[in-house]
Interface confidence: medium
């Protein structure tokens, strides 16, 4: 028999046995020659791989393209289809040979104890049961229990083919968990292996493949690929692949079930395919088909195969990232490679760790980005497999907005002396540096509250029109000096001043600094008064604990009814571009101050004492003063400060040191703290005394040891106390060389 | 070849610095420099490697951060600084290389130094 | 790291006979795995990297295989002087991690 369509010029192989069935007795040999154009190659019954070590297949000694099969010592299970064929064609030649074998009329299974049919109740569909004979003409019946029962072939619906089995229509046999084939020859009963029967549904709920997606490997890695359907109960499954490479040596599909939770109302099928040692002709699309007979159901994926692991950045990979203070900064790391690599950032060359602030992963995330994140990232990639690296560097510029230093530390409302010039600064810090910054004024009275108005913290000015500085008409003459570049606190700021040649008039001034990331602004109020002074005694800046007093001071022909105040605190701090409120026009805000009065020949001066002073006492001080004649009121505001106590530190450390007989050593010792402490020497924990050799000076913060003796050695010690307590730093002085003999001696 | 020295009696809590000399070769990036001990009667036990190359950090095994740091102090020198030492830290200390290929698998550590001991005993 | 699962812990053959050496990865590190013989006082020889290649002047009677996280070293034909330890060792990524080690016995 000849199977396949001819090709061009190619005619069928030709078997030596002209015949499309062959019987042959077991225990005797088969031997069949086939005779070809081409190379040749064997298929037999139970084993398709060529490996079975009973079937030799020789080359013929007679001829090109010709090849023998031989199989000494045939049993029934050798029965079956013979087929020679062309390599990598369908052209082939087939003979079906039947080994009559009456100890074993039944084709035994190749690798199991017992089968398995799949039927399902439908009163139309027919089941096999594969009881293939070796002897093609055997009277089969069909046993089924339990109960047991017997079918014989009807000569219709029912019948028994050696080469396919037992025909029986699937609702006969449904009620029974077991069944076998029959068949008597000489009065002797001979039984197939037992089937199971099963009876099984159709519906499939979905074919899943895992991994599902991302499938990439190197050439020579194995792939395993699990395709996992689920079905109602009863349903049997047939897996079927569909890959690209259809003629892989180190293929391997296992199909089973799984097991699901009792009660369960669904069942699990998997089947894997594995491929121990890709190669490049693997990569495609991957399909897994799951059958039931009456539904499919099918699902892919795309397995990538690489020559070799890699590792590279991708296009997009940046190299300058900007970003505005406070914004969140996402730079990933971009690359092509498998296996994915290790991915490691640094900041300045040192490694960056996970927390929460940063994020050092795949992508590289900054929270809340701030000035100091300016640098030079470097993101390194590693190829697990290779260890090859790849880096790349990103450089994060981070812009700030302009920030005004002074709006923070300068009172908003601080009055001024008529008639004294005064400077005005704006002292910017931006990046980049502000493009410009402009001076703006204002005419107070203009923008004042009316004391019939509700007053608005939010918005304390109701004036909107500000002039240039350049126009000074009606208000004090103004000069506007050059901007100049200082390093203040390690940071390059621009300084904007503006010169008041006289305050005459009380004003509004306001400078505004632009970049390109934002805008500045700082308003000014210059209330300019003729009224009351302030000073404070005994200090500019008390510190905590420390007695201070306030002065406020009139001429008494002038004006009257004395009063201090201090500044509430204001119910909503004053946020950028908002306006301070004239203090004179609203004293809703203010609380009322216990004061003594005094006077000398001119003057009245009202003090207002602070024993014990504490950081809850700073604040915004104001003296009140009434117009005797006109009644209008005056105010006067002082900031006061007051500096916290702080323990004495010292900074840096004193250094061991070794020093020749005759030299000289000079050490310092810097201490901080509030009050400042005293520093006091010491050597070998007693006093040192200063003497023609050894000399203290800045507030004993330099000791100098001059021609040093073999006796100087020992250990010093620097001390800083205060009445909040001491530091100290220690160090050992050793004085080498031998002690030169004086005169005196 | 490889050579390892510094191997020495030391005291529970002591510090010891051992050295990795390489002839014949200097390190690149073709290279990782491995640091391995093995206790007696026991197998070998990662410690840590360096990349020969530029860039990148170390490698430690996850119990040796902290008390061990492998470092390159020349192109054939590379040390490993030991830290509070136990008795456990007894072994013979061996220094390997691990050949890497650009996008080539390694090839394993095919070159070792003979090997140092480090008692460590009150 | 990794965890490298080495068994047996000891095996015995004649000469001439066949021992295998199983060692399983705790997660997958592709192939690269090398296999290690180390005599007493000596330190460990590589004979096999990449699960299966042979190092240069290893005898080709010892055989690698595996991929994933399970391998084999097979050793066939075997001799006196294969009596001794071997290693399994894991080199993927920035994790080098050694199984416990299989004694292997020529009687």
């Known amino acids: 028999a000849s199977v396949g369509l001819p090709s061009v010029s190619l005619d069928l192989p030709r078997l030596s046995i002209q015949k499309d069935i062959l019987t042959i007795k077991a225990n005797t040999t088969l031997q069949i020659t086939c005779r070809g154009q081409r190379d040749l190659d064997w298929l037999w019954p139970n084993n398709q791989s060529g490996s079975e070590q009973r079937v030799e297949v020789t080359e013929c000694s007679d001829g090109l393209f010709c090849k023998t099969l031989t199989i000494p010592k045939v049993i029934g299970n050798d029965t079956g289809a013979y087929k020679c064929f062309y390599r990598e064609t369908d052209l082939a030649s087939v003979i079906y040979v039947y080994v009559q074998d009456y100890r074993s009329p039944f084709i035994a299974s190749v690798s199991d104890q017992h089968g398995v049919v799949y039927i399902t109740e439908n009163k139309n569909k027919t089941v096999v049961i594969p009881c293939l004979g070796s002897i093609s003409n055997l009277n089969v019946s069909l046993c089924a229990r339990y109960p047991e029962k017997r079918f014989v072939p009807d000569g219709n619906r029912i019948s028994w083919d050696s080469k396919k089995g037992f025909t029986i229509p699937s609702y006969m046999i449904s009620y029974a968990g077991m069944v076998f084939c029959e068949a008597k020859i000489n009065d002797e009963s001979y039984q197939s292996i037992m089937y199971i029967v099963v009876v099984v549904g159709y519906r499939i709920y979905d074919v899943v493949l895992s991994p599902s997606h991302g499938i990439e490997l190197s050439v020579g890695e194995k792939l395993v690929l699990n395709c996992t359907a689920r079905t109602e109960l009863n349903v049997g499954i047939d897996f079927n692949w569909e890959y690209p490479s259809s003629k892989h040596q180190h293929k391997k599909l296992v199909n089973r079930d799984l097991k699901t939770q009792s009660g369960s109302e669904m069942k699990k099928f998997l089947s894997t395919l594995t491929i121990d040692g890709v190669t490049r002709s693997d990569q495609g699309l991957y399909t897994c088909a799951a059958s039931s007979g009456l539904m499919t159901k099918k699902n892919s994926t795309f397995v990538r195969v690489h020559e070799k692991p890699f590792v590279a950045f991708g296009s997009g990979m940046e190299s300058l990232v900007e970003a505005t203070v406070g914004e969140r900064v996402r730079i990933p790391a971009k690359y092509l490679g498998y296996p994915p690599p290790e991915i490691k950032w640094y900041k300045n060359g040192i490694p960056l760790e996970s927390n929460h602030t940063i994020k050092a992963g795949h992508v590289l995330t900054i929270m809340e980005v701030s000035e100091r994140d300016t640098g030079n990232y470097t993101v390194i990639l590693t190829n697990p497999i290779s260890k090859e690296k790849q880096s790349h560097v990103v450089s994060l510029v981070v812009y700030v907005p302009p920030q005004i230093g002074e709006k923070s530390l300068i009172s908003p409302v601080d009055s001024y002396q008529y008639g004294t010039t005064q400077t005005l600064t704006c002292t910017v810090y931006a990046i980049p540096p502000p493009h410009h910054i402009h001076w703006y004024w204002q005419l107070e009275e203009e923008c004042a509250n009316e004391p019939s108005q509700a007053v608005s913290v939010t918005n304390p000015y109701p004036c909107e029109e500000w002039r240039s500085v350049e126009d000074f008409q009606g208000g004090n003459k103004i000069e506007v000096n050059k901007n100049q570049f200082a390093l203040i606190e390690g940071k390059n700021k621009t300084v904007s001043t503006l010169v008041i040649q006289a305050a005459n008039v009380s004003a509004l001034y306001k400078c505004e600094a632009v970049n390109k990331v934002g805008r500045g602004e700082r308003v000014i109020s210059f209330h300019v008064t003729r009224g009351p002074e302030i000073t404070l005694q005994p200090d500019m800046q008390p510190t905590e604990q420390e007695s201070v007093s306030l002065w406020c001071t009139a001429d008494r022909s002038t004006f009257e009814n004395l009063t201090w105040y201090k500044l509430g605190p204001q119910p909503l701090p004053i946020h950028v571009g908002e306006l301070p409120t004239p203090v004179c026009k609203n004293l809703d805000t203010l609380w009322k101050l216990n004061a003594t009065m005094f006077s000398n020949s001119t003057n009245d001066i009202l003090i207002m004492e602070l024993k014990n002073a504490s950081l809850q006492d700073q604040g915004d001080y104001v003296c009140l003063a009434q117009d005797r004649k006109t009644k209008k009121r005056h105010c006067v505001v002082r900031q006061l400060t007051v500096l916290e106590r702080v323990a004495p530190t010292i900074t840096g450390n004193l250094e061991n040191q070794t020093t020749s007989i005759g030299e000289s050593i000079e050490v310092s010792c810097t201490a901080s703290g509030n009050p400042p402490p005293q520093i006091m020497w010491f050597k070998d924990n007693e006093t040192l005394v200063e003497d023609s050799g050894i000399v203290l000076k800045d507030g004993n913060r330099n000791l100098t040891i001059r021609r040093v003796r073999k006796e100087d050695e020992g250990l010093y010690t620097c001390q800083a106390c205060s009445v909040l307590g001491c530091a100290k730093v220690e160090a050992f002085f050793i004085i080498e060389g031998a002690q030169e003999k004086t005169n005196l001696e | 070849s490889l050579e390892e020295s510094g191997g020495d009696l030391v005291k529970p809590g002591a510090s010891l610095t051992l050295t990795c000399t390489a002839s014949?070769?200097?390190?690149?990036?073709?290279?990782?420099m491995c640091w391995v001990r093995q206790a007696p009667g026991k197998g070998p036990e990662w410690i840590a490697c360096?990349?020969?190359?530029?860039?990148?950090?170390p490698s430690y095994a996850s119990w040796a951060k902290g008390r061990f740091t492998i470092s390159k102090a020349s192109s054939t020198t590379v040390t490993l600084q030991m830290t509070s030492l136990t008795a456990a830290d007894t072994a013979t200390y061996f220094c390997a290389r691990e050949e890497v290929g650009v996008s080539a698998p390694s090839r394993g550590w095919g070159l070792w130094g003979p090997g140092t001991l480090v008692t460590v005993s009150s | 790291d990794v965890v490298m699962t080495q068994t047996p812990f000891s095996v015995s053959a004649a000469v001439g006979g066949t021992v295998t050496i199983n060692c399983q990865a705790s997660e997958s590190i592709y192939i690269n795995l090398a296999w290690y013989q180390q005599k007493p006082g000596q330190p460990p020889k590589l004979l096999i990297y990449?699960?299966?290649n042979l190092a240069s002047g290893v005898p080709s009677r010892f055989k690698g295989s595996g991929s994933g996280t399970e391998y084999t070293l097979t050793i066939s034909d075997l001799e006196c002087a294969d009596a001794t330890t071997y290693y399994c060792q894991n080199y993927y990524g920035s994790s080098y991690d050694f199984g416990g080690g299989t004694e292997v016995v020529v009687k």
């Open positions: 360096i990349y020969g190359g530029s860039i990148g950090d």
């Open positions: 990449d699960a299966s």
């Open positions: 014949g070769f200097s390190f690149s990036s073709n290279y990782y």
